[in-house]
Interface confidence: low
């Protein structure tokens, strides 16, 4: 059925619509469209012969009329008197006439609106506020927003005028807000600029800041009010009673005990004509003295000596609080407080005791800190550390040898070569070396303070040819798929190149392999039983190379999950049942057997002579390995016949 | 992108016939309405002749009409013009064109390169 | 048929002048006609279709106006490339070109 749709139905003056034509049969001689509900020529728009494809314009054509081939037409630059009805006259070709019928509403895009107000500053709690959208405009719908949300539901909130007067009875503070009032028809809708409602409150009882009252003396009083005003508060101080000053802020610098009273803002709003007040008591106290730290020793010795810290001065009824690196006391068997907390007593002090240490006294108002003391505590010295840490040296370099042990005072350094005394410093220095510069060479530190002194012995070798290395290792029975294995190749030798081989072939390329320290270190990450192997290490200079003897990793692994052999399941009765268990495992595991559940013995091999029906049943196999600490098991159903009722049978061991 | 190729001009004694071709592509050939324009040489532009979607209405210029024949294959995405009793004055680039389904009043949106044809003895 | 005559036939001017031809026909054609620009040795290229609307992809100093029996076409600063022959074409039936206005450098 030929039909008209309206795209769209609801036209906005000055756009278009399309009355897009569905169902238009097939073989047409033509068409013609009709202003109204009926075919009248004296309403015709446009006509259209196809077979000459001329558009022939009616009484009714405006020029704002575009047909198409497919019948459907276009109407531009909508007037309000386009609304209505449009018919389309069809023609087939056998000359058979077909109508339909379309139509569309015309609506005027609609102004932007604007709010009046009857009230621009209506009082808190007293007055109503009536708000209007203009312009009124006929078939227009009217909305609110308030902060761009739809109306919360208030029964101080009312619409009335077809929703174009908005009221709100009794403002508050609250109906401080952005609203707009927006205007809708099938074509349009516009939104006013937001109007902001101005409500005068106030001022509520004001608040005085900081709220704290007790000050010391010589402190600044500083006290702000502020109280919530529209428009904001005028504000007045008094003191006792006694009127100050106009002002927000009330300022008294260096203020003594004379000036502890009543201090009362007072908040008034020129706009409401109310006033309110609030009263604080301010407490000036006298000023305490800064309190400092004395100690009984000045130098304590480490692990000797113990310090006690006094807090000074002696005040009554005071409370004495302490801080260790700005930290609150530690708790330590070696910290001790006095009973009133003025003392603070270190027992067996250590290096780590420096502090600082700061001692506080609390009154009614602040904590008063002393200034930061630190301990000088004597230790050492420490064993020395010779570097580098070369053990082997060519002929004709530098020897240059440092040493350094944790001292206060810091320690006094002394050099022995084959305990002959050499040199005072803690760097020795010997140029182009031989091999008579091999031996024992000793670095000797000294406390003066202390009168302590420790030493170190390091054995230098000066040799053209390299020592035979050993291989050290971190983990002498590693577990499969759990330990990592670090070769290390000794010793460390200067300008000396690190080689290892593996079963006697260079290192295989794996990710579990790692080279480290110059490849001095050899690292085996989550070792497996293949890498049970034999390790070499070898170190080569310009003038030599030597290999060390091999070292053979011992992996512990397993128990694997065991084996029973023989394999066979049935078994004539009369027949010797002799089963073996293995399981791959270092160590060996230990073995033990259960017969339906029921424990037998720890061997590997079960030996039952001329077993019968009642052998029947599940032969469980336990393996145990005690150094990796894990188990394994596994269970073979063995059954019995009686002698001659079944072929194939296994006639036993 | 819209490509329309023409092909089938050429040389032809007067009274002769020709058979241009306009194959099309980048479009929906079957429903567009399809024609043909021709440019003397050294003159304006002359419509010749424009054939609806499904081949039902033809239309033609009165110098033209009787002698020319416009079709369409649109399951070879082709339009023909098919020239007899040719004449002198027919000598001309023969265009052929697109007119857009919509909007209306008729254009040609794409129009090919030009095909020569020359009627002389 | 509808005859259609352009004004001028051919048409001087420099770049960035804004240039008018006018296009008349001998009867009303309501808003059934078509602009074209055509360069030497190519094809006719549409500017304006229905009296007054742009080809997508027209620069916007083409534009067209008119209806009924008088109609113009008009380029706001010529470019360039704007030196050609532009033809106006009736929608109606037959559609009839007019003779051409074409338009060269001063």
């Known amino acids: 059925k030929l039909t008209i749709e309206s795209t769209p139905f609801n036209v906005a003056e000055g756009k278009e619509v399309l009355l897009l034509v569905h169902n238009l049969p097939q073989h047409l001689f033509g068409y013609s469209w009709y202003k109204g509900e009926r075919v009248d020529g004296n309403r015709q728009i446009i006509g259209y012969v196809i077979g000459t494809q001329q558009a022939t314009p009616g009484p009714a054509y405006s020029g704002r009329e575009i047909i198409y081939p497919n019948a459907s037409l276009l109407i531009q630059n909508i007037i309000q008197n386009d609304t209505g009805f449009y018919t389309l006259h069809v023609i087939k070709s056998d000359l058979v006439n077909e109508e339909a019928t379309g139509q569309f509403r015309v609506y005027p895009e609609l102004p932007k609106p604007s709010i009046s107000s009857n009230n621009s500053k209506p009082v808190e709690d007293k007055d109503a506020v009536a708000f209007t959208c203009e312009p009124e405009t006929q078939d227009a719908t009217y909305l609110w927003w308030v902060n761009n949300q739809s109306l919360p539901v208030s029964p101080r909130l009312q619409l009335s005028n077809g929703n174009r007067t908005l009221t709100l009875f009794n403002v508050t503070r609250n109906d401080t807000a952005s609203y707009k009032c927006e205007t809708q028809n099938p074509v349009s809708a516009r939104r006013s600029d937001s109007v902001i409602l101005n409500v005068l409150y106030g001022p509520d009882a004001p608040t005085i800041s900081p709220l704290n009252t007790s000050y010391r003396s010589g402190e600044n009083l500083n006290l702000s009010c502020h109280a919530a005003s529209n428009p904001p508060a005028q504000y007045s101080w008094f003191v006792n009673g006694t009127f100050q000053q106009s002002t927000q802020e009330l300022f008294i610098p260096n203020i003594t005990v004379n000036n502890s009273g009543s201090y009362t803002c007072q908040a008034h709003n020129s706009d409401t004509g109310l006033n309110r007040t609030t009263v604080t008591t301010i407490t000036v106290y006298a000023e305490p003295p800064k309190p400092f730290i004395t100690s009984n020793n000045s130098n304590p010795v480490e692990d000797e000596d113990a310090v006690a810290l006094t807090c000074e001065p002696e005040i009554q009824n005071t409370t004495y609080l302490w801080w260790v690196n700005n930290q609150s006391l530690p708790v330590s068997p070696r910290l001790q407080l006095s009973n009133d907390n003025r003392t603070l007593t270190l027992l067996s002090v250590t290096r780590n005791d420096v502090g600082p240490y700061e001692c506080g006294i609390q009154n009614e108002l602040s904590v008063d800190h002393s200034d930061p003391v630190i301990l000088n505590v004597l230790y050492g010295p420490d064993d020395p550390t010779i570097s580098p840490s070369y053990t082997y040296y060519r002929p004709g370099v530098n020897l240059s040898l440092s040493c350094h042990a944790a001292s206060n005072p810091p320690a006094q350094y002394s050099w022995l070569i084959d305990g002959n005394i050499q040199q005072h410093t803690q760097e020795l220095f010997i140029s182009n070396i031989t091999e008579k510069n091999s031996g024992l060479y000793t670095c000797q530190a000294n406390n003066s303070a202390s009168g302590h002194s420790r030493t170190t012995v390091k054995t230098i070798t000066v040799s053209a040819e390299l020592p035979k290395p050993s291989i050290s290792s971190n983990n002498s029975k590693p577990v499969e798929d759990k330990d990592a294995v670090a070769f290390t190749c000794e010793p460390e030798a200067q300008n000396t190149t690190y080689l290892w081989w593996v079963n006697g072939q260079s290192l295989p390329v794996s990710p579990r392999l790692q080279l480290s320290n110059g490849n001095r270190t050899l690292t085996l990450f989550n070792v497996t039983r293949n890498d049970a192997r034999a390790y070499v290490c070898g170190i080569q200079n310009s003038v030599s190379a030597n290999r060390s003897d091999p070292v053979t990793l011992d992996v512990l692994y397993g128990p694997d999950t065991p084996i029973i052999s023989p394999p066979d399941s049935s078994y004539l009765s009369g027949a010797n049942l002799n089963l073996s268990c293995h399981s791959a495992s270092n160590p060996s595991p230990q073995y033990s057997w259960r017969i339906n559940g029921i424990p037998q013995q720890h061997t590997q091999v079960l030996f039952i002579a001329k077993i019968t029906p009642n052998n029947n049943g599940t032969y469980a196999c336990f393996v145990s390995n005690l150094a990796t600490g894990r188990n394994n098991s596994i269970v073979k159903s063995i059954t019995v016949s009686a002698s001659g009722t079944s072929p194939g049978l296994s006639a036993g061991a | 992108e819209v490509q329309l190729l023409e092909s089938g001009g050429g040389l032809v004694q007067p009274g002769g016939s020709l058979r241009l071709s306009c194959a099309a592509s980048?479009?929906?050939?079957?429903?567009?309405?399809m024609g043909w324009v021709r440019q003397a040489p050294g003159k304006g532009l002359e419509w010749v002749s424009s054939?609806?979607?499904?081949?039902?209405?033809?239309s033609y210029a009165d110098s033209v009409k009787g002698r020319f024949t416009i079709s369409r294959d649109n399951s070879k995405n082709t339009l023909y013009l098919q020239m007899n009793s040719l004449r002198a004055e027919d000598t001309a680039v023969y265009y052929c064109?697109?007119?857009?389904?919509?909007?209306?009043?008729?254009?040609?949106?794409?129009w090919g390169q030009g095909t020569l044809v020359t009627v002389s003895s | 048929d509808i005859q259609m005559t352009q004004s001028p036939s051919s048409l001087s001017a420099s770049v960035g002048d804004r240039v008018t031809i006018t296009c008349r026909a001998s009867?009303?054609?309501?808003?059934?006609l078509n602009w074209y620009q055509q360069k030497p040795g190519k094809a006719p290229k549409l500017l304006i279709y229905?009296?007054?609307s742009l080809q997508s992809g027209v620069p916007s100093r083409f534009s067209g106006s008119g209806s009924g029996t008088d109609f113009t076409l008009t380029i706001s600063s010529l470019q360039p490339e704007d030196f050609a022959t532009y033809y106006c074409?009736?929608?109606?039936?037959?559609?009839?070109f007019g003779q051409g206005t074409k338009l060269e450098i001063k």
């Open positions: 229905a009296a007054s």
């Open positions: 009867q009303s054609i309501s808003s059934y």
């Open positions: 980048g479009f929906t050939f079957s429903s567009s309405y």
């Open positions: 064109a697109r007119y857009p389904s919509v909007p209306f009043p008729p254009h040609v949106d794409y």
């Open positions: 074409q009736q929608a109606g039936n037959p559609h009839t």
């Open positions: 054939i609806g979607s499904g081949s039902y209405s033809t």
